[in-house]
């Protein structure tokens, strides 16, 4: 733990005028000036009544106040005569003291009064040198500390019993411990008073330092009865902007130019790629001009930009469909979630008079108008012989931040010839064992003139087709067999080519003893 | 391209059923018969029976009536064909066809105890 | 039901040299519409049949042009010309003229 810090309330080392404590009875203890080891003048007391027998000499100090403290510590500096050292002495000779104190809410105690003896004096303990001296060497210092509480009252008396001792008292020091203030994970504990026992533990409640923030509860330090911190409860760490230092007993502010994100005890960093700081204490850098960062990216994330334009752009007109393909932009904005948007616009109009607006709801993008992460699409449902424009956009994550519209490359087309659309329905005229008659409305979108149909057939147990042409919107299938069902398809055929086959459509033939009467039916497809 | 997705193998005691799956893909389901054909080890082929997926329509093998039971289901494009009361003579190569044209991998059931 | 006899179980043959692989029926499969519902099939080992011609004649999607199909109301042939490695395997007619269809035996096509 911390160093201890210890408060003195008297100490007589300092005391250079008469102590002028009581001593009981005068013949006993007797103030005499003497020198401390330094050859400072000191005051002490003195008692060798050593030849007679049965001494009980006590000795008090002045009143002591408390200041609030529950345990007190007595500092005894002593030399005592080795009692085989002094000739011609009764047996009572003793080489110890006894301590006392005595409690009272002010200044009371008198010559007779408390009475000179343990109850109502309380005794701390019998004090024992280390060390006696003979006549013939130097006094021999001993230093003996002992402690008492709890205290209660406003102040206390010391007082010392000697019963046949040859001794010095050359210093007396009474002082408290207490815990010095000092910081611990980011806090602030006070200064604070060790308790009433040696194992005594005084909570102190804990403040987080300045620009620190409490990351658990409560905050205390335990101060113990030596005056030392130990077992922390609780911690502050560095708010955001800031970073530890003097050995974590600050939290200082980022300098421009870095940042923290976080709290905690982790440094400041410089500012990632393409953004900054202007003033101290940041806990995120803003980007530059045209430097984003999306929702979804971190303070620590460098900030980046909308990507340049799709590069190379190629178109595949087929009839009134195309493929249209590029290549990745030259720049990604220092991001890797691009995706691609392809904007439709139909053309009105010759050259530089036309107008263009958004193409209708039915053209289809394969395998998608917006979002596409491939660098392909495919297009369809245009109008024939029509000018379009097609716009591939490049976007990235931080596209929506920017006031700008997407950057995006342009391609002109005009769409041919179509070929002609699905043939709707495909109605049964009349079935029989070995053929089947049907007709058909024509497509809804020829796109040109209708040069004839092909019919795809097939059994459906069998599973092999077969093909035939008409140049009428009806056909009789023959060599079928009875009780057999069929599938049949149609597509029309223009100078353009083929159009879409008709969606699958199930007939059945008659058994061979059938009448093969008419069946009118219409048949719509599966 | 036309797919039709039979399970290797299946292990199964004699005395029970047993119920043999074929997923179609890559064309119309309902538009071609679905077939089903046994082929015992080193054997010829014998035909079972077809089924219509469109209106669950079947012809059956007169030998495996009784026996073989077809059966499909339009939402998956899947055809099943459930096999009762085994014996080690039902130990044998299956497949399903689209028509007769296209045919499976097959799946070939052991029948063990 | 109708009997499908390939009389020859197995056919040995030299590669580029062509064979005939014979097939009978017990009943005509020539229906009143004009097709002959007789088809081939190949086995490969380890693999599932595949159809090589239908209605006696045709050639199935995909089949080499070496592959033909003859015969008449009962009595057919498959022909390959030229025979190689990857024609090794089982041939099985089978008629489809009615139910239940049935198959021959089949012919294992052996190289020399």
């Known amino acids: 733990g911390c160093r201890a810090l210890e408060e003195t309330l008297m100490d007589t080392k300092w005391v250079t005028s008469e102590l002028a404590w009581t001593s009981h009875p005068e013949s006993g203890w007797e103030e005499v000036s003497g020198y401390d080891e330094a050859m400072n003048p000191i005051r002490t007391y003195q008692v060798c009544n050593v030849r007679e027998s049965s001494q009980n000499n006590w000795l008090r100090t002045g009143f002591i106040w408390r200041r609030d403290v529950q345990r007190v510590y007595v500092e005894l500096k002593f030399t005592v005569r080795d009692c085989n050292s002094i000739p011609n002495i009764p047996g009572s000779c003793k080489e110890t003291f006894n301590l006392f104190y005595y409690e009272a809410d002010s200044d009371v105690a008198s010559a007779s009064s408390p009475f000179w003896m343990e109850n109502p004096y309380v005794k701390v303990d019998t004090i024992a040198p280390d060390e006696s001296f003979s006549r013939l060497d130097a006094g021999r210092v001993n230093t003996k500390v002992r402690s008492f509480g709890p205290l209660s009252k406003a102040g206390f008396y010391l007082a010392f019993q000697d019963q046949g001792a040859c001794m010095s008292l050359i210093s007396v020091r009474a002082f408290y411990k207490k815990c010095a203030s000092t910081t611990a994970g980011f806090a602030l504990f006070p200064e604070t008073l060790t308790g009433a026992e040696p194992t005594s533990l005084v909570i102190a409640p804990g403040t987080c330092i300045p620009n620190a923030v409490e990351v658990s509860v409560p905050l205390k330090l335990y101060c113990n009865g030596d005056g030392e911190w130990m077992v922390p409860v609780g911690a502050c760490t560095c708010a955001t902007g800031h970073e530890p230092a003097a050995k974590e007993s600050q939290c200082r502010p980022c300098p421009p130019g870095s940042y923290k994100a976080k709290q905690g005890e982790g440094p400041c960093l410089p500012c990632p790629p393409n953004s900054r700081t202007t003033s101290p204490a940041a806990s995120i850098c803003t980007c530059h001009n045209n430097f984003y960062r999306a929702d979804s990216d971190s303070a620590d994330s460098a900030c980046t930009t909308v990507p340049s334009p799709p590069r190379g752009v190629i178109s595949n007109v087929n009839e009134t469909s195309l493929i249209l393909e590029w290549s990745e932009p030259r720049d990604l904005g220092g991001r890797d979630d691009l995706l691609y948007n392809v904007i439709c616009k139909k053309c009105h109009g010759a050259g530089g008079a036309s107008a263009c607006s958004r193409c209708d709801d039915n053209v289809e993008f394969v395998p998608r108008q917006l979002g596409l992460t491939e660098r392909r699409v495919h297009i369809s449902h245009l109008l024939a012989h029509t000018r379009y424009t097609f716009e591939v956009q490049a976007v990235n994550g931080v596209s929506g931040k920017s006031p700008l519209p997407p950057r995006y490359a342009a391609v002109n087309i005009t769409t041919n010839q179509a070929a002609p659309s699905e043939v709707p329905t495909l109605r049964l005229h009349s079935s029989s064992g070995s053929s089947l008659t049907l007709s058909w409305a024509p497509p809804e979108r020829p796109n040109g003139v209708i040069l004839d149909y092909e019919m795809k057939y097939f059994e459906k147990s069998e599973g092999i087709a077969s093909t035939v042409t008409s140049q009428m919107n009806s056909v009789q299938l023959d060599g079928l067999r009875p009780d057999a069902r069929y599938v049949v398809q149609v597509r029309a055929r223009t100078v353009a080519g083929y159009g879409q086959y008709s969606r699958p459509a199930e007939f059945e033939t008659t058994s061979e003893r059938g009448s093969g009467a008419q069946q009118l039916q219409e048949q719509l497809p599966l | 391209q036309v797919q039709l997705q039979q399970p290797g193998a299946e292990l199964v005691m004699p005395g029970a059923s047993m119920k043999l799956s074929c997923k179609a893909s890559g064309y119309t389901f309902t538009s071609y018969y679905i077939h089903w054909v046994k082929q015992r080890p080193g054997q010829g082929l014998e035909w079972i029976g077809e089924?219509?997926?469109?209106?669950?329509?079947?012809n059956y093998n007169q030998k495996f009536k009784g026996k073989a039971t077809l059966t499909v289901d339009k939402s998956s494009s899947t055809a099943y064909m459930q096999l009762s009361s085994l014996t080690s003579e039902d130990s044998a190569v299956y497949y399903c066809?689209?028509?007769?044209?296209?045919w499976g991998q097959g799946t070939t059931l052991t029948v063990s105890s | 039901d109708i009997v499908m006899t390939q009389a020859a179980p197995s056919v040995p043959v030299t590669p580029g040299e062509s064979v005939s692989i014979p097939c009978r029926s017990s009943k005509s499969l020539l229906h009143s519409n004009g097709n002959t519902y007789l088809y081939w099939f190949l086995q490969r080992p380890g693999q599932s049949p595949q159809l090589l011609i239908y209605?006696?004649?045709n050639l199935a999607s995909g089949v080499p042009d070496r592959f033909s199909g003859s015969g008449s109301g009962t009595d057919f042939t498959l022909r390959i010309g030229r025979v190689e490695a990857e024609d090794v395997g089982v041939y099985y007619c089978m008629q489809h003229l009615e139910y239940p269809l049935t198959f021959g035996a089949g012919t294992k096509l052996e190289l020399k």
């Open positions: 209605r006696m004649s």
């Open positions: 089924i219509d997926p469109s209106d669950f329509y079947t």
């Open positions: 066809a689209r028509g007769i044209s296209s």
